[in-house]
Interface confidence: medium
């Protein structure tokens, strides 16, 4: 079976002029997934991102996350890229606090 992930992008104040953007993927199966931040359409280097483990979420599906710190005002240059079971999608940083997107395949 294949269950596409729900992708949820949030932002939080990190320090003066900086924000942490977090991309969470949940309720997906199988567990293999690519989740990465892109700047100007290019994946960020590993040393600028933090990943969570891929964990079971209790419903026979999985969840994970990736985060990075960016400067306030450059949000439009960043997107979260998700690839799962041969399908992929990109998700922008919200202008507000939370944005939830369901992948439509």
């Amino acid at each position: 079976r294949r269950v596409p992930p729900m992708v949820n992008v949030t932002r939080s104040e990190a320090s003066e002029g900086n924000i942490t953007v977090t991309c969470r993927a949940s309720s997906f199966y199988p567990r293999n997934i690519t989740l990465t931040w892109r700047q100007d359409g290019v994946s960020l280097s590993h040393d600028t991102q933090q990943w969570g483990d891929v964990l079971p979420d209790g419903n026979g599906t999985y969840q994970t996350w990736v985060a990075t710190r960016i400067c306030q005002g450059e949000e439009q240059r960043f997107t979260c890229y998700m690839e799962h079971s041969g399908n992929h999608s990109t998700h922008p940083v919200p202008s507000g606090k939370v944005l939830v997107l369901q992948s439509h395949w």
């Epitope: 100007d40 359409g41 290019v42 040393d47 990075t68 710190r69 400067c71």
Partner: antibody, heavy 121, light 112 residues
Framework: QVQLVESGGGLVKPGGSLRLSCAAS????????MSWIRQAPGKGLEWVSY????????YYADSVKGRFTISRDNAKNSLYLQMNSLRAEDTAVYYC??????????????WGQGTLVTVSS | DIVMTQSPLSLPVTPGEPASISCRSS???????????LYWFLQKPGQSPQILIY???NLASGVPDRFSGSGSGTAFTLKISRVEAEDVGVYYC?????????FGPGTKLEIK
């Protein structure tokens, strides 16, 4: 080995147009962002434009905005720069470069040999 | 736009001696991800530029280890521990933090 070969330069009158091409080989072109950088005769380097691997992010220097258009054809491993309304100050050698900013040697680690654009009446 | 300045603009050096080039930016190039987006390029006579240093202090592939980069948010230095004849050319610093990317005016290194 990585090769970037620019073409399409030449002599053009002010107000005219040119289309530069850059043929890439030796690497997976569709994986990498690309930039055009120019150098006026005897002068320094000036960044002109950027395009992301999928073509969804594009940026221009203010000096060329509205006149130049960057594009790419990943199937043909080619990068382009359409230059319209050319001015004398656009006279320069134009280089195409890989912009592998989040990989290995990072930004602008490969450059073509350049193609000379001369704008003169 | 971020303005990049370099000094000196001309640098005559005796082979085997060290050399140092300074670069300054009008804005800090230290990103919140702790990378500093400053690059050094060398353009040898009649050639295309080549990358020497990326992210302020990282030596690009194939570059001799006599080259090194250091600095802080707005002040940067390229050092050559022992200059060789093949090091002649124009050295440029460049900021890659934000658009438009901007270069310094260049420092011409010549052999005495």
């Amino acid at each position: 080995q990585v090769q970037l070969v620019e073409s399409g330069g030449g002599l053009v009158k002010p107000g005219g147009s040119l289309r530069l091409s850059c043929a890439a080989s030796g690497f997976t072109f569709s994986n990498y962002a690309m930039s055009w950088i120019r150098q006026a005769p005897g002068k320094g380097l000036e960044w002109v434009s950027y395009i992301s691997p999928g073509g969804d992010y594009i940026y221009y220097a203010d000096s060329v905005k509205g006149r130049f258009t960057i594009s790419r054809d990943n199937a043909k491993n080619s990068l382009y720069l359409q230059m319209n309304s050319l001015r004398a100050e656009d006279t320069a050698v134009y280089y195409c470069t890989t912009d592998r900013r989040h990989y290995g040697s990072y930004a602008m680690d490969y450059w073509g040999q350049g193609t000379l654009v001369t704008v003169s009446s | 736009d971020i303005v990049m300045t370099q000094s000196p603009l001309s640098l005559p050096v005796t082979p085997g001696e060290p050399a140092s080039i300074s670069c300054r930016s009008s804005k800090s190039l230290l990103h919140s991800n702790l990378n500093t987006y400053l690059y050094w390029f060398l353009q040898k006579p009649g050639q295309s530029p080549q990358i020497l240093i990326y992210r302020m202090s990282n030596l690009a592939s194939g570059v001799p280890d006599r080259f090194s980069g250091s600095g802080s948010g707005t002040a940067f230095t390229l050092k050559i521990s022992r200059v060789e004849a093949e090091d002649v050319g124009v050295y440029y610093c460049m900021q890659h933090l934000e658009y438009p990317f901007t270069f310094g005016p260049g420092t011409k290194l010549e052999i005495k």
